[in-house]
Interface confidence: low
């Protein structure tokens, strides 16, 4: 039975040209995290594998940095980065947990963080 929950940074906004940290946290489970995938609408950004470490998609090597922790840092943001991002936690024995973050990249300096929320 999957008992865990994923807490994410929720709906967030950032300014064009800036950077943002995408962060998920898996709680309420003793399952072992074997791998975390970061994806944007089914496009793989990065993988953090318990055995192999970090792997950044070649297309994003210049703009994506691993961490902090199991999170992901997006740099040199453009308005095209606006959209949904997913953290996919592969765990044993529970299975797969998915968290969703919506990022809005703004042209002007009106960026502010949204409230944190939980995804069951």
């Amino acid at each position: 039975m999957m008992t865990g929950t994923i807490e994410t940074t929720g709906n967030i906004s950032a300014e064009k040209g800036g950077s943002i940290i995408l962060q998920c946290h898996l709680s309420s489970t003793t399952a072992q995290v074997t791998q975390v995938n970061w994806e944007q609408q089914d496009q793989l950004l990065a993988i953090c594998n318990a055995d192999l470490g970090w792997h950044i998609s070649p297309s994003f090597k210049d703009r994506v940095a691993p961490g902090p922790g199991l999170g992901l840092t997006l740099q040199s943001l453009t308005v095209n980065d606006t959209g949904e991002y997913f953290c996919i936690y592969h765990t044993y024995p529970d299975g797969t947990y998915t968290g969703r973050i919506f990022l809005e990249v703004l042209e002007s300096s009106v960026a502010e963080h949204g409230a944190r929320f939980q995804i069951p």
Epitope: Q41, D42, Q43
Partner: antibody, heavy 118, light 114 residues
């Protein structure tokens, strides 16, 4: 239980447009996931055609992009494929499938054979 | 496009055999590979995702391994119902407007009774 079922003409004339519909039961296609079309020519391997996401975003195989349109009818919980200017090379079993992010194509329809012939 | 090469295209084995089916990618995929089983006239079934994770309900005799460009599906003790065609698939990326790599499948390896 999630089920996908393809429907549409089994025979299409060359240069015409192939139109297929996938009816999904047991899950609302506007809730989550990417909803895909995949084809398999007789005796050959699988080719991904494209998808439409639960939020309406589309993505197509570049080799087919100029001829493909995938759309959704939320009221009927269906998504559709249109492939224009077909030739005999488009003869294949066409299947719809649901992809779960981070996993793969987890649910498939049984597929429907479309033959392109005069 | 990322090419997925499956060789051999067919393989003969007996019930109880240990079988390995290789798949080679044309570029580094990390662990973003899935494996499917397809029987004649039926839809493919997902067996393995992220190179080595068994999908729900898949028997433990099926296992996947590999990272980078070389991947393997292993059936530890072949059962009569395992004779089918097996496809590897890269799930590394999808074609967005600025990123034009489609999901691609290998040509398949048909597992036949010896």
């Amino acid at each position: 239980q999630v089920k996908l079922q393809e429907s549409g003409p089994g025979l299409v004339k060359p240069s015409q447009t192939l139109s297929l519909t996938c009816t999904v039961t047991g899950y609302s296609i506007t809730s989550d996931y990417a909803w895909n079309w995949i084809r398999q020519p007789p005796g050959k391997g699988l080719e991904w055609i494209g998808y439409i996401t639960y939020s309406g975003g589309t993505s197509y195989n570049p080799s087919l992009k100029s001829r493909v349109t995938i759309s959704v009818d939320t009221s009927k919980n269906q998504f559709s494929l249109k492939l224009s200017s077909v030739t005999a090379a488009d003869t294949a079993v066409y299947s719809c499938a649901r992809r779960q992010i981070g996993l793969g194509f987890t649910y498939w329809g049984q597929g429907t054979l479309v033959t392109v012939s005069a | 496009d990322i090419q997925m090469t499956q060789s051999p295209s067919s393989l003969s084995a007996s019930v109880g055999d240990r079988v390995t089916i290789p798949c080679k990618a044309s570029q580094d995929l990390s662990t973003a590979v899935a494996w499917y089983q397809q029987k004649p006239g039926k839809a493919p079934k997902l067996l393995i995702y992220s190179s080595s994770y068994r999908y729900t309900g898949v028997p433990s005799r099926f296992s996947g391994s590999g990272s980078g460009t070389d991947f393997t599906l292993t059936i530890s003790s072949l059962q009569p119902e395992d004779f089918a065609t097996y496809y590897c698939q890269q799930s590394y990326s999808t074609p967005q407007q600025h990123y034009s790599t489609p999901w691609t499948f290998g040509e398949g390896t048909k597992l036949e009774i010896k």
